[in-house]
């Protein structure tokens, strides 16, 4: 079953390479499971960026090798992506399947829009 | 055209084993991923397992963790589902799923293998 996905257009990296964007997803019934997936789309190529579960009220449990962080309230997913850089820069698509209980739903969103701009080396002071 | 073709369903006792299988033909192709999903009689599709192609990692449902276990063989385009201890509230109908990319969403079905658990 489907279900529609939110998230926002356009994100802009941190000089640190971070960026953070909210998956908000509109749950159908009252989902006790969910998975998320964050996935980047780039020259028609689409790639597996992390992927974690959680039940609702917990932290998103995410690999130990991770490069995303994340939390839950309600429907929201705040989702933080790590050591990001100008390479990186694509479109950012968030999937979120309600696993349990049944029936099972599945949404993806349209995708945020990372720019990643490297920064500059600092001048060498004398 | 793709084609997913379940096998291995049937009817077995309480306590008993069976593994299905779902083939996929039609091409040469590289899946997202796999997944197995069921329906009993009169409720709701239920999600059961799948695989994901690029760790190899793999997700159950709580009803079948510890029980079932997903698996694949890419040069076959292959997907298992080896049930072990089954409970008659296992009894459905198991459909295979695949995804071509992880945004397409589950592109394509199978017909179903029916597996039946008597107590």
């Known amino acids: 079953k489907a279900m529609h996905v939110a998230q926002p257009a356009v994100v802009l990296a941190s000089s640190r390479g971070i960026a953070s964007f909210v998956c908000e997803y509109a749950s159908p019934g009252k989902a006790t499971e969910v998975r998320v997936t964050v996935l980047r789309q780039a020259d028609s190529q689409v790639t597996e960026v992390c992927a974690a579960t959680y039940m609702m009220g917990n932290e998103l449990t995410f690999l130990d090798d991770s490069i995303c962080t994340g939390t839950s309230s309600g429907n929201q997913v705040n989702l933080t992506i790590q050591g990001l850089r100008a390479m990186d820069t694509g479109l950012y698509i968030c999937k979120v399947e309600l696993m349990y209980p049944p029936p099972y739903y599945l949404g993806i969103g349209n995708g945020t829009q990372i720019y990643v701009i490297d920064p500059e080396p600092c001048p060498d002071s004398d | 055209e793709v084609q997913l073709v379940e096998s291995g369903g049937g009817l077995v006792q309480a306590g008993g084993s069976l593994r299905l299988s779902c083939a996929a033909s039609?091409?040469?192709?590289?899946?997202?991923?796999m997944g197995w999903f069921r329906q009993a009689p009169g409720k709701e599709q239920e999600f059961v397992a799948d695989?994901?192609?690029?760790?190899?990692?793999?997700y159950y449902a709580d009803s079948v963790k510890g029980r079932f276990t997903i698996s694949r063989d890419n040069a076959k385009n292959t997907v298992y589902l080896q049930m072990n201890s089954l409970k008659p509230e296992d009894t459905a109908l198991y459909y295979c799923?695949?995804?071509?990319?992880?945004?397409?969403?589950?592109?394509?079905w199978g017909q179903g293998t029916q597996v039946t658990v008597q107590s």
């Open positions: 799923a695949a995804e071509m990319s992880g945004i397409s969403g589950w592109d394509y």
């Open positions: 695989i994901r192609t690029s760790a190899g990692r793999t």
């Open positions: 039609g091409g040469t192709f590289s899946f997202y991923g």
